[in-house]
Interface confidence: low
């Protein structure tokens, strides 16, 4: 189910999947619940900490069993991922943090009058990821006003230093806010060049383009079809970026598909969850359960309802069926995304739906934690 | 709202306008979105007008002057008002609309978390109260949806403001002592919320006050948390599933 | 004390035209739906227009609709019936009310004016 | 449009007599009706609302009942005050009255 609470004084110890820095608990919380494997996480305060290196620090962990032995530490806040959480999923982030400077590659500088105006700059730039802005009073005159556009190889700061006079923030582009605008088309048999920041295997380009539009750097992408000539290649989702923003060649090519992220759409984003099951289809990954249930909706539902499932085929040979109901294999992968996907099987294949938005589950529950 | 500011898109997704079409077609009311198809607003929006099919329901809204004929609008499927709430004692100001059709929840529209049953150990300190409504005591609805940061004020300190009424511990207060912020006409109904731990909770429902934004005269909400056996009980659906963001 | 006053009836010809007048004291005027009520000689009740707070909000009975209008000036706290068009069958004592108190959706009238006579007559 | 239809017309009755008169709605109006009393020359008092709820100052002999389409309003002893015409209203859609119930001394 969902747990929302937050631990103060209280950090989750082991279950290492990722760290960053991001500047509070709740957008750490934020990159717990995007990261396909993290169910935990803890977060460390400048307040908490001496080590400068980790100030600002956000852990975020995996579990077998859904939990961790907290420890006792002065100032931590730890806390639950919001998969399952149905609304109160949302990669928006609209907090603005004074005296905080969040740090990156600046790769625009302008003089504006408010940090609020520095935002909708960040967020009307295809490649702004966070700013920061020094106001009229910071120390140094030549920096006043200054708004600094930056991003990072991961989306998040490369470090973030207490700063007085200094503001930042995140762009609001998950929000729903920019002003760019996106192209939602799909372009059959072309295939974009420029820079891979990630490679994935999903069952077709819509997912491909959903999992591009959530990744911090991915800009556009191709995606090579079941039918593409090189069989190590099929399925395959390459995620791109390039300075520009767009992309700088595009090849005709038979059976790949691209396209572009869909994060600076107006008022519309997709979901982060993909919600259609592929019949014929094997998804293969490290295998977290087997059950028996009946039909494959039944199967995707007890994917999403057991957290760390990501992904499940439901197979219909005669050998893993007995009378109404057949196996179902619940499954996981390091980056969510099946680790070989397979056709012509007897069977059906899907994702979890832990990440939809939509969900009528209780996604508001604060579970009171015993002492 | 007076005292207030524009709102930004999607900065309170819950917020709907409950506006009414006969001759004309104007915003009376707000309202918050709880669930894909409930929406809990003020008992006294209804005052006059019980009519279900006059009412139109805008979601996901910011700017009322971007409202044309073509803007879709929900419309409502029943009309719940709470069995004890009289005007004359402003007790119980509280209703449901269930509407016609679930909502998809977008970044626009999406619904408000609700407080936990008789919470009354959280320590609130981050309110805000929302609304279209007017902007001065004699003014007029605001097109950009306005916001404005309200301190909570205990029901003593509230109760000797308004010596005339009995604020009960069904409400709760929320001003400054020197005014000049409050909610005020045409925003009754909408939502007083507060973030908690990161989250934002439905703590009250915009109902009364003595003018806007007078000294000494803070305005009055609907206690939410108070009628959570209420609100579950009347959005229980048949199959036994809570149609709203329940807490546990 | 809670008053209504109705004022501007009398004798008027078919297709003629009056003007009523409903002023309102002892309450918050501006915070109440209000509305007229007539009845003809030795009949019953007829329910004839009601307005919203605000003003903003008008609702006819199909009788009158098209010939009257409500209309409200909350600053003078009083309550306006338009009449046009006027046939035999609007001579009526016509009542103004409003509900002043009570649980949602209570919209019967608590509180009426001593009414003032409309008769249209050739 | 919602038509109330109310019986009799009208009762002659006695003091001290328990008296009935019934309305009828021609759709379902749910607990929307209220009951008035009205003496010539003066307006309308109200007496009931919500079908059954007695309104504050109105003697306890007065009582109302029912739902749907049928509704009573009762007047269990009745006292010489009480000669008067009667009228239901339904305030589920718009407002509508009966065509009242006069209840005269026998």
């Known amino acids: 189910g969902c747990l929302t609470q937050l631990y103060e004084n209280a950090f989750f110890r082991g279950g290492d999947v990722a760290s960053m820095y991001t500047p509070n608990a709740q957008y750490c919380q934020m990159r717990c619940t995007f990261h396909p494997r993290c169910l935990l996480f803890s977060f460390l305060p400048a307040s908490s900490i001496n080590d400068m290196e980790k100030r600002f620090g956000c852990f975020l962990k995996d579990s077998v069993t859904g939990t961790l032995p907290k420890v006792h530490r002065t100032g931590a806040v730890s806390g639950h991922s919001l998969k399952q959480c149905g609304h109160q999923i949302s990669a928006c982030h609209r907090d603005i943090y004074k005296g905080v400077d969040m740090r990156g590659v600046n790769f625009n500088v302008s003089k504006v009058s408010s940090v609020e105006e520095c935002q909708k700059r960040c967020t009307s730039n295809i490649r702004c990821q966070f700013f920061s802005y020094a106001t009229q009073t910071f120390h140094k005159a030549e920096y006043r006003n200054n708004c600094l556009l930056k991003y990072s190889p991961g989306g998040t700061p490369t470090a973030i230093k207490v700063l007085s006079n200094v503001e930042s923030g995140f762009s609001l582009k998950p929000c729903a806010l920019s002003e760019i605008g996106c192209h939602m088309n799909i372009f059959q048999h072309l295939a974009f060049s420029d820079v891979d920041v990630a490679r994935v295997l999903t069952p077709d380009a819509f997912v491909c383009r959903t999992i591009c539009t959530y990744h911090p750097n991915c800009l556009f992408f191709t995606f090579y079809t079941n039918v593409w000539k090189i069989e190590s290649q099929r399925n395959v989702c390459l995620l791109k970026t390039s300075e520009s923003g767009t992309p700088s060649s595009s090849t005709p090519q038979e059976n790949t598909i691209s396209g572009y992220s869909l994060l600076t759409c107006k008022r519309t984003l997709p979901e982060p969850c993909h919600s259609k099951i592929y019949p014929g289809v094997d998804f293969g990954g490290e295998e977290l359960n087997v059950t028996f249930v009946k039909g494959v909706n039944v199967c995707q539902e007890t994917c999403t309802k057991m957290i760390r499932c990501q992904f499940f085929t439901y197979s219909l040979l005669p050998e893993d069926c007995k009378e109404e109901k057949c196996k179902c294999f619940l499954r996981l992968s390091m980056d969510g995304s099946p680790t070989r996907i397979a056709y012509g099987t007897q069977g059906s294949s899907g994702y979890s739906l832990r990440l939809c938005n939509t969900g009528d589950n209780s996604v508001c529950t604060t579970k009171t934690s015993t002492r | 709202i007076v005292g207030g500011t524009n709102s930004s898109w999607g900065e309170w997704p819950w917020q709907v306008s409950l506006q009414v079409k006969l001759t004309a077609q104007r915003h009376l009311c707000g309202g918050s979105l709880i669930g894909h198809q409930w929406v809990l607003t003020a008992a006294h929006c209804f005052d006059g007008l019980p009519l279900q099919d006059v009412w139109r329901i805008y979601s996901g809204i910011l700017n009322l002057s971007d409202i044309t004929k073509d803007t879709p609008f929900s419309q409502i499927k029943e009309i719940i008002i709470h069995q004890n709430y009289k005007v004359s004692e402003g007790n119980h100001d509280i209703a449901l609309i269930k509407l016609q059709a679930p909502l998809n929840y977008t970044e626009f529209q999406k619904p408000i978390c609700l407080p936990s049953k008789g919470d009354t150990s959280t320590i609130y300190t981050n309110c805000w109260v929302t609304g279209w409504g007017f902007s001065k005591e004699k003014g007029e609805i605001q097109n950009i949806l306005q916001k404005v940061n309200i301190p909570l004020v205990t029901n003593e300190e509230c109760q000797k403001r308004y010596q005339d009424y009995k604020i009960t511990q069904r409400m709760v207060c929320a001003g400054y002592k020197e005014g000049g912020k409050d909610a005020c006409k045409g925003d009754s109904g909408g939502p007083l919320v507060c973030k908690h731990n990161g989250m934002w909770r439905l703590v009250g429902i915009t109902s009364w006050g003595e003018g806007c934004a007078r000294r000494e005269q803070p305005g009055v909400y609907t206690k939410v948390a108070e009628y959570m056996d209420w609100i579950l009980e009347k959005t229980q659906s048949s199959d036994g599933k809570a149609q709203m963001q329940s807490p546990a | 004390e809670v008053q209504l006053l109705e004022s501007g009836g009398g004798l008027v010809q078919p297709g003629g035209s009056l003007r009523l007048s409903c002023a309102a004291s002892g309450f918050t005027f501006s915070h109440y739906i209000m509305m007229w009520v007539r009845q003809a000689p030795g009949k019953g009740l007829e329910w004839v227009s009601g307005?919203?707070?605000?003003?903003?909000?008008?609702v006819y009975a199909d009788s009158v609709k098209g010939r009257f209008t409500i209309s409200r000036d909350n600053s003078k706290n009083t309550l306006y019936l338009q009449m046009n068009s006027l046939r035999a069958e609007d001579t009526a004592v016509y009542y103004c009310?409003?509900?002043?108190?009570?649980?949602?959706?209570?919209?019967?009238?608590?509180?009426w004016g001593q009414g003032t006579m409309v008769t249209v007559s050739s | 449009d919602i038509q109330m239809t109310q019986s009799p017309s009208t009762l002659s009755a006695s003091v001290g007599d328990r008296v009935t008169i019934t309305c009828r709605a021609s759709q379902s109006i749910s607990s929307w009706l209220a009951w008035y009393q009205q003496k010539p020359g003066k307006a309308p008092k109200l007496l009931i609302y919500k079908a059954s709820t007695l309104e504050s100052g109105v003697p306890s002999r007065f009582s109302g009942s029912g739902s749907g389409t049928e509704f009573t309003l009762t007047i269990s002893s009745l006292q010489p005050d009480d000669f008067a015409t009667y009228y239901c209203?339904?305030?589920?859609?718009?407002?509508?009255f009966g065509q009242g119930t006069k209840v005269e001394i026998k």
């Open positions: 009310a409003y509900r002043r108190t009570g649980v949602p959706r209570r919209d019967e009238f608590d509180i």
């Open positions: 307005i919203y707070s605000s003003g903003g909000i008008t």
């Open positions: 209203q339904q305030y589920n859609t718009y407002w509508t």
